[in-house]
Amino acid sequence: FERTRSLQDPCSNCPAGTFCDNNRNQICSPCPPNSFSSAGGQRTCDICRQCKGVFRTRKECSSTSNAECDCTPGFHCLGAGCSMCEQDCKQGQELTKKGCKDCCFGTFNDQKRGICRPWTNCSLDGKSVLVNGTKERDVVCGPSPADLSPGASSVTPPAPAREPGHSPQ
């Protein structure tokens, strides 16, 4: 029965970008400017998102898809579909309730967003610190102290720094 009814429903013929206009004998009318319908058979068009203030337009609203927003320079997107814009900080900083603060000693942030993370503990992998960490960079771990003893072969190159994880958006 449902399938039969949908086949007879004139609104089911209205494609995306239109709405089924009850005021015009269920004719398919184009979505007016600043509105869209992303699926067929809709009885109304949705209002387009406006990218205002700290948001800027990434992609205009078309008749079939909503506008896509981005953040103005100095801010970055957070949340699904860039629902929020968060202030950028410098590398070596993290955003707190009181604004951008330098990373504490022993932590680093190599991005303009996210939190400060602890330096890699080289000794956990049985290695030594080859290059000291900074607020902006993780430490670089090198060969273990035993590998550096006299007579030991030093053909093996130092292991690369562990890839820092990306903070969630």
């Epitope: 970008g17 979505c31 600043n34 869209f36 990434r58 609203c61 078309s62 079939t64 981005d70």
Partner: antibody, heavy 113, light 112 residues
Framework: VEESGGRLVTPGTPLTLTCTVS????????MIWVRQAPGEGLEYIGF?????FTYYASWAKGRFIISRTSTTVDLKMTSLTVADTATYFC????????????WGPGTLVTVSS | DVVMTQTPASVSEPVGGAVTIKCQAS??????LAWYQQKPGQPPKLLIY???TLASGVSSRFKGSGSGTEFTLTISDLECADAATYYC??????????????FGGGTEVVVK
Amino acid sequence: VEESGGRLVTPGTPLTLTCTVSGFTINSYHMIWVRQAPGEGLEYIGFINDGGFTYYASWAKGRFIISRTSTTVDLKMTSLTVADTATYFCARGVDGTSYPDLWGPGTLVTVSS
Amino acid sequence: DVVMTQTPASVSEPVGGAVTIKCQASQSIGSDLAWYQQKPGQPPKLLIYRASTLASGVSSRFKGSGSGTEFTLTISDLECADAATYYCQCIYYGSDDVIYHTFGGGTEVVVK
């Protein structure tokens, strides 16, 4: 809206066209470039939107670059050929879209050896 | 690419008559279609966008309709000033920063 910079150039010569506007703020609108070869139809090149993002027709991507200041929009063209001979129009988009509604008179670019 | 096929290429009608121009898209574009009028030596003029929305200052004698792949521009009560070439144009986004904002081939309207 007024275009400038069109002239006679030889193939391969780079050229930059400038669109100067008054009476409205460029960064509140989509600003569009369209061209028309002599006696031919209209061809959409691309636009820079109100957010500063650029979009190009597939044939124009890589060879044309659109940029803007607060009062001008530039169209940088490279590797020009005889087929690029056309009147180049700059236009403002209507109602937050990339449909051109306010057009300049156009500037003629002739590519010939 | 989205191809816009515009018909007829040319049409001639008397003053007071009506003209219908059709535009067919190679794939569904919702209602993202505009119509322009261009006279020799002039830039185009936007008549209709979003398939049926009349642009500012345009006479209500111009009517746009259609959705999906089939669109129509109707000019009623023709005037001598309507003699021009008319173009349809779609708005369609491809991947990345590529667009298919394609124009139709144009229709020359002659008013007798």
